[in-house]
């Protein structure tokens, strides 16, 4: 197993409608054709897997149905989307990613990225 | 080393807007966001907002809503605050500060922005 | 909103004692979420403990942060000339972003 340098930005505030977006780069010491990318949380020392997805280079990625994230490769980049994010889901978001194939195998895990979520305010009861 | 520089003293007429701007250097501007807080004379720290110098998103104090608009210039590495309709208790020294992942730090220097008629 | 009280108002105290600052939530705050900032006449806030009990760089070992849910604590273990300021605490777990009030540690 060989490390890598990921990078993801430090903090990013989630929109109102609950969705925060970041890329995740990583420094690819050789041409990879398979690349596995994990979304994890860390909260209160507590790691949690949020999403993952395996992708072939020059496609997209492809995470399960019912996952909250979405997402597009361009060369050494990822553009990670999450959505659905509650105020109780704010912490660090980091991004690890795995060159899968061909040999020899690389792992890279970022700093991650605090995303901050806001719930937005309830709407003031009006009479009809 | 990471900087935040303001810019300088003000004074306006009550209704009056004011544009406040946080320069940053030594460090990713749109890796982290800024955050805004001020301090009327003699008092303690205020939390006005923040934003994030990443995706342009922002949290705005409520009571501050509708007259506080914070913006970035990532092109400069610069942060702003106006504030609009100003009226003599928003007389106060205004900060910006880095915010990371769990922290503000460093702060600019500070603004002193005087509302008198 | 959660609301931070600080206790004491003001701490009147010596060089070379034991300083002791509380900081009470009215909610409570996930650790990684509170921070303690020292404030002197005329200067900006400082940045001394993140995350409840982190020192932040360049901050001597004489600081120190502990609690966690509603009651958290700095201690300064052996005041030094410099100490002499107010020290605020805050919280950013939850929006609204809240400082408490203050607590001013003055020369006895």
């Known amino acids: 197993c060989k490390a890598m340098h990921v990078a993801q930005p430090a903090v990013v505030l989630a929109s109102s409608r609950g969705i925060a977006s970041f890329v995740c780069e990583y420094a690819s010491p050789g041409k990879a054709t398979e690349v596995r990318v994990t979304v994890l949380r860390q909260a209160d020392s507590q790691v949690t897997e949020v999403c993952a997805a395996t992708y072939m280079m020059g496609n997209e990625l492809t995470f399960l149905d019912d996952s909250i994230c979405t997402g597009t490769s361009s060369g050494n980049q990822v553009n990670l989307t999450i959505q659905g994010l509650r105020a109780m889901d704010t912490g660090l978001y980091i991004c690890k990613v795995e060159l899968m194939y061909p040999p020899p195998y690389y792992l890279g895990i970022g700093n991650g990225t605090q995303i901050y979520v806001i719930d937005p305010e309830p709407c003031p009861d009006s009479d009809f | 080393q990471v900087q935040l520089v303001q810019s300088g003293a003000e004074v306006k007429k009550p209704g009056a807007s004011v544009k406040v701007s946080c320069k940053a250097s030594?460090?990713?501007?749109?890796?982290?966001?800024i955050s805004w807080v001020r301090q009327a004379p003699g008092q303690g720290l205020e939390w006005m907002g923040w934003i994030s110098a990443y995706n342009g998103n922002t949290n705005y104090a409520q009571k501050l809503q509708g007259r506080v608009t914070m913006t970035t210039d990532t092109s400069t590495n610069t942060a702003y605050m106006e504030l609009r309709s100003l009226r003599s208790d928003d007389t106060a020294v205004y900060y910006c500060a880095r915010v990371g992942a769990n922290w503000f730090d460093p702060w600019g220097q500070g603004t002193l922005v005087t509302v008198s008629s | 909103e959660i609301v931070l009280t600080q206790s004491p108002g003001t701490l009147s105290l010596s060089p070379g004692e034991r300083a002791t600052l509380s900081c009470r939530a009215s909610?409570?705050?996930?650790?990684?979420?509170l921070a303690w900032y020292q404030q002197k006449p005329g200067q900006a806030p400082r940045l001394l403990i993140y995350g409840a009990s982190s020192r932040a760089t360049g901050i001597p070992d004489r600081f120190s942060g502990s609690g966690s849910g509603t009651d958290f604590t700095l201690t300064i273990s052996r005041l030094e000339p410099e100490d002499f300021a107010v020290y605020y605490c805050q919280q950013y777990g939850s929006s609204p972003w809240t400082f408490g009030q203050g607590t001013k540690v003055e020369i006895k």
């Open positions: 030594g460090y990713t501007f749109t890796s982290y966001g």
């Open positions: 909610q409570s705050v996930s650790s990684s979420y």
